[in-house]
Interface confidence: medium
């Protein structure tokens, strides 16, 4: 053992443990023959508070009165200083400043499960800064008492390790907690309770769900509970939802029928239990059960649209498109779509199942009246078919919407507006706005998008599958019975000058003029809807300004004549393209000399 005070002593009065705000007297005294060797009056005793000098005195002892000590521990060390030598440690003392414990508040006890043990918690109040012991006492019927002590610095919980049983569920028990330290003690108010008040059931377990005859409308939830449970509450929600549906049930005996579940939906289920209608507390929620409800046959009808393309004098190509049903309408995994094509006068019908696509293309005669029906099928059945009579959608000129415009509306949106057709506007049953990426070859594989608009609307915001710097061919159809009229326009959500000009691939001479042919600018370099092409030419080796000819852009056009060139003069020609945002850089340059005679 180390003797840290072999040269002297430090005494503290009234005590090493004091109440905040009290004064202490500290005395440091040397033991015999422990002073400075030559002359004891040269002894200089110094008192340190931690590492700061607070007092000194020449002689064999030093007295110091100390006030204003903070909560917690303060170390005082007494040292001896002799001439020409280091200070020597004599002795020291620690003073503990604290307060008496406050009355513990909010004492509450709980027994987790019928087989659990009684444990209590309380609020200690402010920190005493001293070693404080807590004693928890429980008294019950027949003068039974239990006691448990806690010596941890921050004690606010104790478990008695005893189990209350339901033999006499109305018997009263009283708990009390007492805090004691060197400066005082304090007891909580007593807490009185019965078995039913404090037993918190274990959460239900072994939860499972059954669907009779694989039907969502006949669903039973099963679980297991402790024996004395009287009440349950169930909560359930679709896995992608934050809101719970709640159900309270009495005497459920571990089962309950659920009537409002949606088909083909993953749900999360949890259950909680309670022993008594108005006494005690609910158990924790059980672990979640996740289960998917069975499919039901689809509801709703598919949104179907189509496109006709002339092949030759006797045949036409029909392309059908439809949109997926919403999850709530599909009510299961759509296995296939059933498409029926029928000639109405002859009664011939052809049915085909389509999997993995939402479109279908076929070739039919140009004669006859044709109709299609499309439905979606899951494992339980099919949706009601959507029927459409195939007609010439743009045939009725008087039904064509007027003054169609397409304007950019923020990022990746296009606002399409129109005026009703000249023919009686009230005859319009609906408008359909259709859009697809513009491809110079008129590629039928390009995805088609459409939306339906009520007959009183004269605008539609299109945003689905709209990309910046892409030109879209937009059509507005007005439908009335078995007639339709349409108008079209080009539009983009965002544009800039094209990245390149057209590539001239040939210049040919024809009767004193020339015909320039070019390759279209690749779609990804057009940067929006092209408005014009410009053809520039100037005499080779001339510094004069080039002449130009501006041609309105048409999708299918890729040649143009020029008849203002002089014969036997070599010209340099090039082309550019323009969007509403500006002009492209030059395309390739070609030289050409017209051989014809001068006029």
């Amino acid at each position: 053992k180390i003797d840290a005070c072999k040269r002297g002593d430090v005494t503290v009065k009234p005590s090493h443990v004091i109440l905040l705000g009290s004064t202490v007297n500290i005395t440091c005294s040397l033991k015999p023959r422990q002073g400075c060797f030559h002359y004891s009056r040269r002894n200089k005793l110094i008192l340190y508070k931690f590492d700061r000098r607070i007092n000194f005195h020449h002689g064999h002892s030093l007295n110091s009165q100390v006030t204003g000590l903070p909560l917690g521990t303060t170390l005082f060390v007494c040292k001896l200083a002799c001439i020409n030598s280091d200070e020597i440690q004599i002795c020291g003392a620690e003073i503990f400043v604290g307060v008496a414990p406050e009355q513990p508040q909010n004492l509450s006890c709980i027994q987790k499960g019928e087989q659990g043990t009684v444990a209590c918690t309380w609020e200690r109040g402010r920190d005493t800064h001293l070693y404080t012991e807590y004693t928890l006492q429980l008294s019950g019927p027949k003068n039974l008492t239990w006691q448990k002590q806690c010596k941890d610095i921050y004690c606010d919980y104790l478990d008695f390790g005893i189990n209350l049983t339901p033999e006499s569920p109305e018997s009263n028990f009283t708990a009390k907690v007492t805090a004691v330290n060197s400066l005082g003690s304090s007891s909580s108010l007593p807490s009185t309770f019965t078995f039913l008040d404090i037993v918190r059931p274990l959460p239900p377990w072994d939860i499972r769900i059954k669907f009779q005859k694989a039907s969502v409308s006949r669903c039973t939830l099963y679980w297991r509970d402790e024996g004395l449970v009287l009440l349950n509450r169930l909560r359930y929600r679709p896995s992608n939802s934050r809101l719970w549906n709640m159900v309270n049930v009495t005497k459920a005996k571990g089962r309950h029928d659920l009537l409002d579940l949606k088909p083909f939906t993953e749900y999360e289920f949890q259950i909680s239990s309670k022993l008594h209608l108005y006494k005690g507390s609910w158990s924790d929620w059980s672990e979640s059960l996740r289960a998917q409800t069975p499919e039901e046959e689809p509801t709703g009808m598919l949104d179907v649209w189509y496109m006709k393309r002339h092949i030759d004098y006797s045949r036409q190509q029909i392309s059908l498109f439809w949109k997926n049903l919403s999850v709530s309408e599909a009510r299961g995994k759509i296995l296939h779509y059933q498409v029926t094509l029928q000639e109405l006068t002859g009664g011939k019908a052809m049915t085909q199942n389509i999997t993995g696509h939402t479109s279908w293309t076929t070739v039919i005669p140009r004669t006859g009246n044709w109709a299609v029906a499309v439905s979606a099928a899951n494992s339980k059945g099919s949706s009601l078919p959507t029927r459409i009579n195939i007609m010439n959608l743009c045939e009725a000129g008087l039904l064509a919407p007027r003054q169609v415009s397409a304007n950019s509306e923020g990022m990746d949106n296009i606002l399409v507006t129109w005026q009703p057709p000249r023919k009686d506007p009230s005859a319009v049953q609906e408008y359909v706005v259709e859009w697809r990426e513009l491809h110079p070859g008129g590629d039928t594989q390009v995805p088609l998008n459409w939306l339906r608009s009520r007959p009183y609307n004269v605008s539609a915001l299109i945003s689905e599958n709209i990309k910046s710097y892409i030109c879209y061919e937009i059509r507005v159809y007005a439908l009335s019975g078995d007639q339709g009229g349409c108008s079209s326009i080009l539009g983009n959500s965002k544009h800039k000058a094209p990245l390149s000009g057209p590539h001239i691939n040939a210049i040919t001479e024809e009767k004193g003029s020339i015909l320039i042919s070019w390759n279209s600018i690749p779609v990804q370099e057009q940067m929006g809807c092209l408005l014009h092409y410009r053809i520039y030419w100037k005499e080779r080796d001339s510094n004069s300004q080039p002449q130009l000819c501006e041609i309105p852009y048409r999708v299918s056009q890729n040649s143009h004549p020029i008849n203002s060139l002089q014969p036997r003069v070599t010209y340099v020609l090039w082309m550019t393209a323009l969007t509403a945002a500006g002009e492209s850089s030059h395309g390739n340059e070609r030289e050409f000399c017209l051989q014809g005679k001068a006029n």
Epitope: Y131, K151, D152, I153, Y154
Partner: nanobody, 131 residues
Framework: QVQLQESGGGSVQVGGSLRLSCAAS????????LGWFRQAPGKEREGVAT????????FYADSVKGRFTISQDNAKNTVYLQMDSLKPEDTAMYYC???????WGSGGNRCSLWLPAYNYWGQGTQVTVSS
């Protein structure tokens, strides 16, 4: 019974680092003060650093401030002393010590390095710093 087991000592060059560990058992760890002390040959034992696990309060001797770091892992009832920028004068036997709360109050908001307060001691681990 109370046990304090030090480890991590060894030999190191000037400017090097070592990490000492002290595993405590047999008493209420959280309401004790735990400290590191050292004793060089022919010198008195002196305090190095101390920590109060329940409150995380820390106290260092002036000679090691800024170079040594005391820390704790309450789950393992273990206190560590990270020693960096070691000097030859750090050569000593390093002891882990604990003071039971009952003997010395709670330890309060500041454990001190006053030797008599510590009533449980480990066997020590040697640290040698050579130039």
């Amino acid at each position: 019974q109370v046990q304090l087991q030090e480890s991590g000592g060894g030999s190191v060059q000037v400017g090097g680092s070592l990490r000492l560990s002290c595993a405590a058992s047999g008493f209420t760890y959280s309401s004790s003060c735990l400290g590191w002390f050292r004793q060089a040959p022919g010198k008195e034992r002196e305090g190095v650093a101390t920590i109060y696990p329940a409150g995380g309060n820390i106290f260092y001797a002036d000679s090691v401030k800024g170079r040594f770091t005391i820390s704790q892992d309450n789950a393992k009832n273990t206190v560590y002393l990270q020693m960096d920028s070691l000097k030859p004068e750090d050569t000593a036997m390093y002891y882990c010590a604990a003071r039971g709360g009952q003997t010395w109050g709670s330890g309060g908001n500041r454990c001190s390095l006053w030797l008599p307060a510590y009533n449980y001691w480990g066997q020590g681990t040697q640290v040698t710093v050579s130039s």
